[in-house]
Interface confidence: low
């Protein structure tokens, strides 16, 4: 049976086997087409999600679809039901928390009172002044907190206590990529991890340990990638994996926060990378122990210079490394998080591509997660 399962897939109606390589090849090889059902699926960017959270204290903003203008949500008459609606619009199913925060002197958006219509937040028509003088600070999920804070050094062995959202994504029990837990059902990783194997069946996620071999494997229900853009073939290197059963959070299994929509990180901002990837370019082997390293944001202009990536780094990507080189992600780290710490840890990038590993002029290139928040929210909403 093990051999059969490894090399063959069982079609129903009538029962017969087909070679496993015929899974997810775009052709209906089973009469009912079940060989094409459990495959990596693409999902369009979708419409603009009409709510968002700002890095200014996680304050809620609402889109007026008629004008295309964004407004800050006033705390007046804001309720738990409105908080739940806002989070559902972003695809969250967990119980949100919210509080009032004072309108700051730098408030640049108009502040309006919020109401609900057809399970979407709307601006109240006759909205007067914001009497409370407060904005809504909203958290849809408790995220980005770890038991241990890493020390700021070059490269060192990591503990799962520091990075409880890190997972190993494995195909046929072999580590292929890293990934990050976003909520009980969802793991964030890179689309290119699934280029070779597009059948969901053999992919597993392992969470809760910093050692590659030692964690229980979790079944995957869906793998969703964003649609390919032929104009920018390296863009859209992002994927979401939906787990078959929700994770139970613990000290070693916790979610990382998504970035805020306006999370613009300036050059030299300190960031962290983690992974079980190759410890040497073109050789070495996967690290059995999770490794961590501190890096920094590298200016996109520098990254696109003639001696570096020559314009290949688009606005939906970001570069990170250290100016002198030597600290970088490598093969096997793909899909893992590039992380920024403010009050919580945020996954600002996904390990995507680069020339070599650790070269001074060719740092790691990462998918910029803030560029894909709309897509993530639309996928989650479709799967609620």
């Amino acid at each position: 049976k093990v051999i059969l399962d490894k090399y063959y897939f069982l079609c129903g109606q009538p029962l017969h086997f087909i070679p496993r390589k015929q899974l997810c090849d775009g052709e209906l090889d089973c009469p009912l087409g079940e060989d094409e059902e459990h495959c990596v699926k693409s999902f369009p960017e979708g419409p603009a999600v009409a709510v968002r959270l700002s890095k200014d204290r996680s304050t809620l903003q609402v889109l007026d679809s008629a004008t295309g203008n964004w407004f800050s949500a006033c705390f007046d008459n804001f309720t738990e039901a409105l908080a739940e609606t806002a989070c559902r619009q972003m695809g969250y199913s967990s119980k949100p928390t919210f509080r009032a925060v004072e309108i700051g002197p730098d408030q640049d958006l108009d502040v309006v009172e919020i109401t609900e219509n057809s399970q979407e937040l709307r601006m109240r028509n006759s909205s007067g002044p914001c009497l409370s003088g407060s904005l809504v600070s909203l958290h849809c999920l408790a995220c980005g907190k770890s038991l241990k804070t890493p020390r700021v050094v070059g490269v060192e062995e990591a503990s799962v206590d520091s990075w409880p959202w890190q997972v190993s994504i494995q195909y046929d029990k072999q580590h292929v990529c890293g990934g990050s837990i976003l909520d009980p059902h969802w793991v964030l990783t890179a689309a290119h991890c699934f280029r070779k194997h597009t059948d969901v069946f053999n992919w597993k996620v392992r969470a809760g340990s910093d050692k590659l071999g030692s964690f229980p494997s979790l079944a995957v229900a869906k793998i969703i990638i964003i649609e390919f853009n032929p104009m920018y073939p390296k863009d859209n290197d992002i994927a979401l994996m939906k787990l078959q059963f929700p994770l139970t959070f613990s000290g070693t299994v916790r979610p990382i926060c998504l970035p805020f929509f306006d999370e613009e990180l300036t050059p030299a901002t300190p960031l962290w990378i983690i992974g079980w990837g190759f410890t040497k370019q073109n050789g070495g082997k996967m690290s059995d122990i999770l490794l961590q390293a501190s890096v920094q944001v590298i200016d996109s202009t520098r990254c696109n210079a003639d001696d570096a990536y020559q314009g290949e780094v688009t606005e939906k990507m970001m570069c990170a490394g250290i100016p002198e080189g030597g600290v970088d992600t490598c093969q096997g780290d793909s899909g893992g998080p590039l992380m920024y710490q403010s009050d919580q840890w945020h996954v600002v990038g996904i390990v995507s591509w680069g020339y070599g590993c650790g070269g001074p002029s060719t740092p790691g290139v990462y998918t910029k997660v803030s560029a894909y928040l709309n897509w993530i929210y639309n996928v989650w909403k479709a799967e609620l």
Epitope: G26, E27, C39, S42, P230
Partner: antibody, heavy 121, light 107 residues
């Protein structure tokens, strides 16, 4: 097996519009791009544009921009090509052709049987 | 856009003989070249893609070669069903463009 079945021949007057359909079967409809290619009588092949059935994104050839609209209906696995402001030089056989999803400008591995559109006053 | 030029316009060859069709691109298209066969009243059929890879179900007598700007389709031993019009198409640059065709006829 993969099949692309197109609607029947059409005769149109100059200035009118025509809408040709192409029904796909035998594969996952949203996993492949669909292109439209036309061939005037006794002439070569001319690429008109592409639609992504998964997200309905389109790219049209320069010669057809402003006159062509490509749409799809995922419930029936059908793509449509509408050409407006018809002129006599639009008389041609119009083909839908399937192309893999990993790159937009690509070989066409399966073709519809073609739909003859005649534009005549 | 890239202009594809096929030669000759018509090629007369006897059954059993070898036929060589040429296609030239106005600028490099790397190996992004396909060949199609079209018979009267039928849709084109993919023969070769990637300049040299035979499509599924295409007999081994069809072979493609070349890269950059010069490409060749060779039919090693012509069968009666091979007499048709052959088109080359580049897909290395948008929009994909076709050659004007080579008519392969019985000598």
């Amino acid at each position: 097996q993969v099949q692309l079945v197109q609607s029947g021949a059409e005769v149109k007057k100059p200035g009118a519009s025509v809408k040709v359909s192409c029904k796909a079967s035998g594969y996952t409809f949203t996993s492949y791009y669909m292109h439209w290619v036309r061939q005037a009588p006794g002439q070569g092949l001319e690429w008109m544009g592409i639609i992504n059935p998964s997200g309905a994104g389109t790219t049209y050839g320069h010669n057809f921009q402003g006159r062509v609209t490509m749409t799809r209906d995922t419930s029936t696995s059908t793509v449509y090509m509408e050409l407006s402001s018809l002129r006599s030089e639009d008389t041609a056989v119009y083909y839908c052709a399937r192309g893999p999803r990993d790159t937009a400008m690509v070989r066409f591995d399966y073709w519809g049987q073609g739909t003859l559109v005649t534009v005549s006053s | 856009e890239i202009v594809m030029t096929q030669s000759p316009a018509t090629l007369s060859v006897s059954p059993g003989e070898r036929a060589t069709l040429s296609c030239r691109a106005s600028q490099s298209v790397s190996s992004y070249l396909a060949w199609y066969q079209q018979k009267p009243g039928q849709a084109p059929r993919l023969l070769i893609y990637g300049a040299s890879t035979r499509a599924t179900g295409i007999p081994a007598r069809f072979s493609g070669s070349g890269s950059g700007t010069e490409f060749t389709l060779t039919i090693s031993s012509l069968q009666s069903e091979d007499f048709a019009v052959y088109y080359c198409q580049q897909y290395g640059s948008s929009p994909g463009t076709f050659g004007q065709g080579t008519k392969l006829e019985i000598k």
